[in-house]
Interface confidence: low
């Protein structure tokens, strides 16, 4: 989990009873709460996009928040891998890219996330409420998926909001580490709110800056990174009946929309628990100007100041010449 | 619909060399990376060579070293394998494919139909 | 070089009836992102290979459910629930964890 998280913003305390100083030792423990829930604690968002321009178009998108390096990315549809699931891409940020009908094409964004468009391609159709999951394999903290659908009612060019089903291989290295690594600050806040009980709790608000909107500082703060809001626009047939799979590239321009990353109990589990995970549906969705759905109070993913793109298919290394990694 | 086309059947002298070429629609061949397999009649597969990221580039098999070159046409999306002192236990159903990862596990998604080289004099 | 080794060479089963194929890697295919690194393929008579399962256990689009890949390490199985007509041919796994990427001999699945 990024340090930079947002958290809610604080009722100020009631004048005369605070000063300056006051509200903000008021404002760490919350700070500190928040990063010692959420840090260490691995995210994946999947967002699925229809377009309005063409019915039969979708865009999935996946990202990792994680401070882990990413290992290996599966995209799969139909459920989870070990769950009756079928690959639809694996995207390795070193040695490439490999996609499978009705994937038409798998592509990194940034070194955290991922896009893929699709077509369907006969019997490979899929339908408008398929369920697309994606798996990252990260090292320390281990491998975690989150699926995603569109809502059986979704309008054209409106996007489903990061759904939540992350599944957990803990890794012990993660748990030690992050484990280590959070005992001060933890400490230091317990320490903190002792100092604090005997005042009342503040209130919580959504914050002012409406955190449902894309932010480009939050979504990507280096210059850069800034290129990772360019993504291509996906094509699938959601009709459920057989099409053909053409060659030509998708269409369309950039797409200026975020998206944000799932929020729910993470709780260790193996494969075999995949297949009776349920996939909670969520609900209290708000509009927002340019066509994104997004759950309230929710916030954009970040990207580190370091980042780094990866426009190239080919991934994050890949080499240049004949020879170069694909 | 992606395909991977194939030279037709070649019948070659011992010691000579044989160029197999496998040209690809449907996808960029600088997005993927081609390998070749091979098939003696009646046996099993045999991985010629392809792409090894541990080494940057395209290797082939040890036991092939020295006499077989892989070589790719970006601007004709066609990839080639040459394999020179032919003999006659070369004689067997040749095939491109993509996708074979070193390290990685990626599946071959995609072959061509074979090219049949005969070795005999 | 890692050296796969397919049982049975030959499988003779009834229509409808299960099957299964073992592989076994002179080493552990398993990688420390946690995946197997192995693939089964069907060569059909007369054609090329085609991919059935990838990463051991995923299967790959377009392929009936009735096939699934299971294992880990050096230990691999292919299962098919219920063998129809169109499965007979030769089935084969691949080890690519490292170069030379090798194969297994091929089970031979014949219908009784």
């Known amino acids: 989990m990024r340090t930079e998280a947002q958290v809610p913003a604080l009722q100020p305390p009631e004048p005369g009873l605070e000063g300056a100083m006051g509200h903000r030792t008021l404002v760490l423990p919350w700070v500190l709460l928040t990063l010692c829930v959420t840090a260490g604690t691995p995210e994946v968002w999947v967002q699925v996009r229809m377009e309005a321009t063409e019915l039969s178009s979708f865009t999935i998108r996946c990202g990792f928040l994680g401070s882990g390096s990413i290992s290996l990315v599966t995209v799969s549809w139909g459920g989870p891998n070990g769950a009756g699931g079928t690959t639809l891409a694996v995207l390795h940020p070193e040695r490439g890219i490999r996609q499978w009908a009705p994937a038409r094409q798998a592509r990194w964004e940034t070194q955290s996330s991922i896009s893929l468009i699709l077509e369907g391609s006969g019997a490979s159709s899929p339908c408008a409420n398929t369920t697309f999951c994606c798996k990252f394999a990260s090292f320390p903290e281990g491998s975690w998926e989150a699926c995603g659908s569109l809502p059986p009612s979704s309008d054209p060019g409106l996007s489903a909001p990061p759904t939540p089903a992350p599944i957990l291989r803990a890794d012990l290295a993660g748990i030690l580490g992050v484990s280590g690594v959070l005992l001060f600050g933890c400490v230091y806040l317990l320490h903190l709110l002792r100092r604090h009980k005997h005042r009342p709790a503040p209130r919580l608000q959504p914050s002012r800056t409406s955190p449902q909107a894309p932010r480009a500082r939050a979504w990507a703060p280096s210059q850069a990174s800034q290129a990772a809001l360019h993504v291509p626009y996906a094509t699938i047939n959601t009709s459920c009946r057989p099409a053909t799979l053409d060659t030509a590239h998708p269409h369309g321009g950039p797409s200026w929309w975020a998206s944000l990353p799932t929020h729910a109990a993470h709780r260790p589990q193996g494969p075999a628990a995949w297949a009776s995970t349920p996939i909670p549906a969520r609900g209290s969705f708000v509009s927002v100007e340019n066509g994104l759905y997004a759950q309230a109070g929710e916030r954009p993913p970040h990207t580190g100041p370091g980042l780094t793109l990866f426009p190239d298919p080919r991934g994050p290394r890949a080499m240049e010449g004949p020879l170069g990694v694909r | 619909q992606v395909q991977l086309v194939q030279s037709g059947a070649e019948v070659k002298k011992p010691g000579a060399s044989v160029k197999v070429s496998c040209k690809v629609s449907g996808f960029s061949l600088s997005h993927f990376s081609m390998h070749w397999v091979r098939q003696v009649p009646g046996k099993g597969l045999e991985w010629l060579g392809g792409?090894?990221?541990?080494?940057?580039?395209?290797i082939p098999a040890q036991k092939f070293q020295g006499r077989l070159t892989m070589t790719e046409d970006t601007s004709t999306e066609t990839a080639y394998m040459e394999l020179s002192s032919l003999r006659s236990e070369d004689t067997a159903v040749y095939y491109c494919a993509t996708g074979i990862w070193y390290s990685s596990g990626w599946p071959v998604d995609y072959w061509g139909p074979g090219t049949l080289v005969t070795v005999s004099s | 070089d890692v050296v796969m080794t397919q049982s049975p060479l030959s499988l003779p089963v009834t229509p409808g009836g299960p099957a299964s194929i073992s592989c076994r890697s002179s080493q552990s295919l398993l990688d420390s992102s946690g995946y197997n690194y192995v693939d089964w393929y069907l060569q059909k008579p007369g054609q090329s290979p085609q991919l059935l399962i990838s990463l051991g256990s995923d299967r790959a689009s377009g392929v009936p459910d009735r096939f699934s890949g299971s294992g880990s390490g050096t230990d691999f199985t292919l299962k098919i629930s219920r063998v129809e007509a169109e499965d007979v041919g030769i089935y084969y796994c691949?080890?690519?964890?490292?170069?030379?990427?090798?194969f297994g001999q091929g089970t031979r699945l014949e219908i009784k």
């Open positions: 691949m080890q690519a964890l490292q170069t030379p990427i090798t």
């Open positions: 792409f090894d990221p541990e080494e940057g580039g395209t």
